[in-house]
C-alpha cells in the first residue's frame, strides 16, 4: 500500500498520477485530491491471512476492519471491485471473530445509494463482535502433493499439484514462467519482457499443462497486454515484476487455478519453507525442462542474504531471497517470473517471481525473488485501470 | 416520474434469439443498478440478471452463458440478450431498478415484455 | 443458493381483517428481505425493503419485520385495494431469490 515507502513525509502520501502529496485526512473522504482521483479508489484492502476487510478512516488516518453487522454480499462485491477484481471472480465471504479490535467501520444501510465507503460510519462498537473476511476470487488451493521434487537434479510436479503456473512461450518456445493471479491476469518478471519482447503479440500462455510438447498452438492464450513495472531497473533487476493480460480468459478446474496474492499483515519468517516450480533448466548451462518442477526451498533473511559472502548488498526490499545458503536446490534458466510460494491456512500465496541469481544451486548463491508483497498495490492497481 | 419501458418480446423458437430493450426516464440512469427478472404464466418471479453502475454483470445459473445483460448510458437503455432460447425461458420478462445497490431492492418495475419460445 | 419459501401460500380474509405472511429463509440474511405486492396483469410494486422500512407511497397499514432466517409481512386492516399476491425476496446474497408467493383473495 502506497502509506508505506512513498516519497512523501511520514504525514503525506503521493498521488500516483502527479507525485504530489496530499493530506492523509484528505484520502478517502469522498473527494477527488489526486488529479486521476486515486485517493478515493484505493480505500480497501484485505488483511492478514485470514483476508480481513479493512477500510481506509479519513477521519483517524488509519485502516480499521469492517464489523459484521448488516453486511451482505452486495458490498462485498463491492470492495473486491475497487480492489481491481472483477464481479465475476468474488468468490466468498466468511465472518471472522475479532474480539481484539476496538475500532470498526460500520454500515450504514439508510446512507441511500451513494458508494461503499460513504455507506461506511466510524464506531467503536460492533455488535456481532464479528469481522468481515473476503474472499474475491477463490484462489491459493491445489491438489494435495506430497512427492518432493527439485528444478536443479530433480523430478517432475504432479498434475494440478502448481495450478497457478504458466508457461510463457514466444514463437513455440519456453522463455519464462508465470502465475496465474486471476482469470485474466498472469503475473512475471519485468527482466522477462525487456524489449523488444514487450510486444504482447509475441506472447503465448500455457495454462494446466505439465509438458512442454503438448503445448502447441491450439491450446495457448493469446496475451493482450504487457505491463512491466515502471520502475524496473535492468541493471540491478529491481522491481523485477511484469503483469500480463490474456485475451480470452482462462477457465479455471483442477489443473488451471489461481495463486492467492498476499495480503499486507502477512508476516513471514526466515526459514519459511516455500516452493519454486517451472521448466526452467535442471542444472547450470543446460537445456530447458520438457516437464514441470518443482522444489522445496527456504527463505533467507534479506541481512544474511546481503552479507559480504553472499550478494554483498544487492538485495533490495522489493527482492526476497530463498534457496539454501549449501546450494543444492535453486531455480535456474527458464523459470524465471515464475512462483515462489508458501503456504499458510491452508491457502498457498505468492511471495515471489523468480527473478536472478549468480549460478544454478550454488553454495552461497540462493535464488532471488521479486517481493511480491511490495508489488500487491500495484497489481491491483493496474488491474483497477483496466477495469 | 421515473418510468421504465420494456420492448422486443414476442414469438421465437427454440434454440433462437431475442433482443429485450428497457428504456428508462426520470431519474440518473447511470448511477442505478438495473436487473431483469421474469415470471411464466402462473407462476413466481425469478430472477435473471443484473448489470451494476460500473457495467459488472451478475447471472442465475439457469441462463449463464446463453443470456448477455447490457447497458448504455448515453440511450438510458438496459438490453437483455437471449440466445438459445428453450421452452422453459417463456416468461414476461420486467426490467426493474435497484433503489440502493447495497440493499439490492428493487424500486420500480417496468410493465414487462412477453417472451414466448415455441415452435 | 438460498431458498425462499412462504406460508401460508393462499388465503381468504375480509376488509378489516389483520393479516399476516411470513417467509423463512433457508440461510441466515440478515435484514436483506424484501417485500413486493402484484396484481393479476401487473408488474410487481415494493411495499417493504431491507426487513421493515416502507417505501416511500406505501399506506403505513403495511409493516415488516424479522431479520436472520424469518421474516413477516402484516397488513393491520385489509383494504379492498389489497387483495393481491405477495412475494418475499432475499437480496442478501446471489442469486437473489423471490419467494413462491402467498396469493391473498376476499372470503
Known amino acids: 500500500w502506497k502509506f508505506m515507502g512513498s516519497k512523501c513525509s511520514n504525514s503525506g502520501i503521493e498521488c500516483d498520477s502527479s507525485g504530489t502529496c496530499i493530506n492523509p485526512s484528505n484520502w478517502c473522504d469522498g473527494v477527488s485530491h489526486c488529479p486521476g482521483g486515486e485517493d478515493e479508489n484505493r480505500c480497501v484492502r484485505l488483511y492478514g491471512p485470514n483476508f480481513i476487510l479493512q477500510v481506509y478512516s479519513s477521519q483517524r488516518k488509519s485502516w480499521h476492519p469492517v464489523c459484521q453487522d448488516d453486511w451482505n454480499e452486495n458490498y462485498g462485491r463491492a470492495a473486491c471491485r475497487d480492489m481491481g477484481y472483477k464481479n465475476n471472480f468474488y468468490s466468498s465471504q466468511g465472518i471472522v471473530d475479532d474480539s481484539g479490535s476496538t475500532s470498526f467501520m460500520k454500515l450504514n444501510t439508510s446512507a441511500g445509494n451513494v458508494d461503499i465507503y460513504k455507506k461506511l460510519y466510524h464506531s467503536d462498537a460492533c455488535s456481532s463482535k464479528a469481522v468481515v473476511s473476503l474472499r474475491c476470487i477463490a484462489c491459493g488451493v491445489n491438489l494435495n502433493s506430497s512427492r518432493q521434487s527439485r528444478i536443479v537434479g530433480g523430478e517432475s510436479a504432479l498434475p494440478g499439484a502448481w495450478p497457478w503456473q504458466v508457461s510463457l512461450h514466444v514463437q513455440n518456445v519456453h522463455v519464462c514462467g508465470g502465475s496465474i493471479i486471476t482469470p485474466e491476469w498472469i503475473v512475471t518478471a519485468a527482466h522477462c519482457v525487456e524489449k523488444p519482447l514487450n510486444n504482447p503479440w509475441h506472447w503465448t500462455a500455457f495454462a494446466g499443462i505439465l509438458r512442454q510438447s503438448f503445448m502447441f498452438y491450439g491450446a495457448g492464450y493469446q496475451v493482450e497486454k504487457v505491463i512491466s513495472h515502471p520502475n524496473y531497473d535492468s541493471k540491478t533487476k529491481n522491481n523485477d515484476i511484469a503483469l500480463m493480460k490474456l485475451q480470452k480468459p482462462l477457465t479455471f478446474n483442477d489443473l488451471v487455478k489461481p495463486v492467492c496474492l498476499p495480503n499486507p499483515g502477512m508476516m513471514l519468517q526466515p526459514e519459511q519453507l516455500c516452493w519454486i516450480s517451472g521448466w526452467g533448466a535442471t542444472e547450470e548451462k543446460g537445456k530447458t525442462s520438457e516437464v514441470l518442477n518443482a522444489a522445496k526451498v527456504l527463505l533467507i533473511e534479506t541481512q544474511r542474504c546481503n552479507s559480504r559472502y553472499v550478494y554483498d548488498n544487492l538485495i533490495t526490499p522489493a527482492m526476497i531471497c530463498a534457496g539454501f545458503l549449501q546450494g543444492n536446490v535453486d531455480s535456474c534458466q527458464g523459470d524465471s517470473g515464475g512462483p515462489l510460494v508458501t503456504s499458510k491456512n491452508n491457502i498457498w500465496w505468492l511471495i515471489g517471481d523468480t527473478s536472478w541469481g549468480s549460478g544454478c544451486a550454488k553454495a552461497y548463491r540462493p535464488g532471488v525473488y521479486g517481493n511480491v508483497m511490495v508489488f500487491t498495490d500495484w497489481i491491483y492497481r493496474q488491474m483497477r485501470a483496466d477495469g | 416520474e421515473v418510468q421504465l419501458v420494456e420492448s422486443g418480446g414476442g414469438l421465437v423458437q427454440p434454440g433462437g434469439s431475442l433482443r429485450l430493450s428497457c428504456e428508462a426516464s426520470?431519474?440518473?440512469?447511470?448511477?442505478?443498478?438495473m436487473h431483469w427478472v421474469r415470471q411464466a404464466t402462473g407462476k413466481g418471479l425469478e430472477w435473471v440478471s443484473a448489470i451494476g453502475s460500473a457495467g459488472d454483470t451478475l447471472y442465475p445459473d439457469s441462463v449463464k452463458g446463453r443470456f448477455t445483460i447490457s447497458r448504455e448510458n448515453a440511450k438510458n437503455s438496459l438490453y437483455l440478450q437471449m440466445d438459445s432460447l428453450r421452452a422453459g425461458d417463456t416468461a414476461v420478462y420486467y426490467c426493474?431498478?435497484?433503489?440502493?445497490w447495497g440493499s439490492g431492492y428493487l424500486d420500480y418495475w417496468g410493465q414487462g415484455t412477453l417472451v414466448t419460445v415455441s415452435s | 443458493d438460498i431458498q425462499m419459501t412462504q406460508s401460508p401460500s393462499s388465503l381468504s380474509a375480509s376488509v378489516g381483517d389483520r393479516v399476516t405472511i411470513t417467509c423463512r429463509a433457508s440461510?441466515?440474511?440478515?435484514?436483506?428481505l424484501n417485500w413486493y405486492q402484484q396484481k393479476p396483469g401487473r408488474a410487481p410494486k415494493l411495499l417493504i425493503y431491507v426487513a421493515s422500512s416502507l417505501q416511500s407511497g406505501v399506506p403505513s397499514r403495511f409493516s415488516g419485520s424479522g431479520s436472520g432466517t424469518d421474516f413477516t409481512l402484516t397488513i393491520s386492516s385489509l383494504q379492498p385495494e389489497d387483495f393481491a399476491t405477495y412475494y418475499c425476496?432475499?437480496?442478501?446474497?446471489?442469486?437473489?431469490?423471490f419467494g413462491p408467493g402467498t396469493k391473498v383473495d376476499i372470503k
Open positions: 440461510q441466515s440474511i440478515s435484514i436483506y
Open positions: 426493474a431498478r435497484v433503489g440502493d
Open positions: 426520470g431519474f440518473t440512469f447511470r448511477s442505478y443498478d
Open positions: 425476496q432475499q437480496s442478501y446474497g446471489t442469486p437473489f431469490t
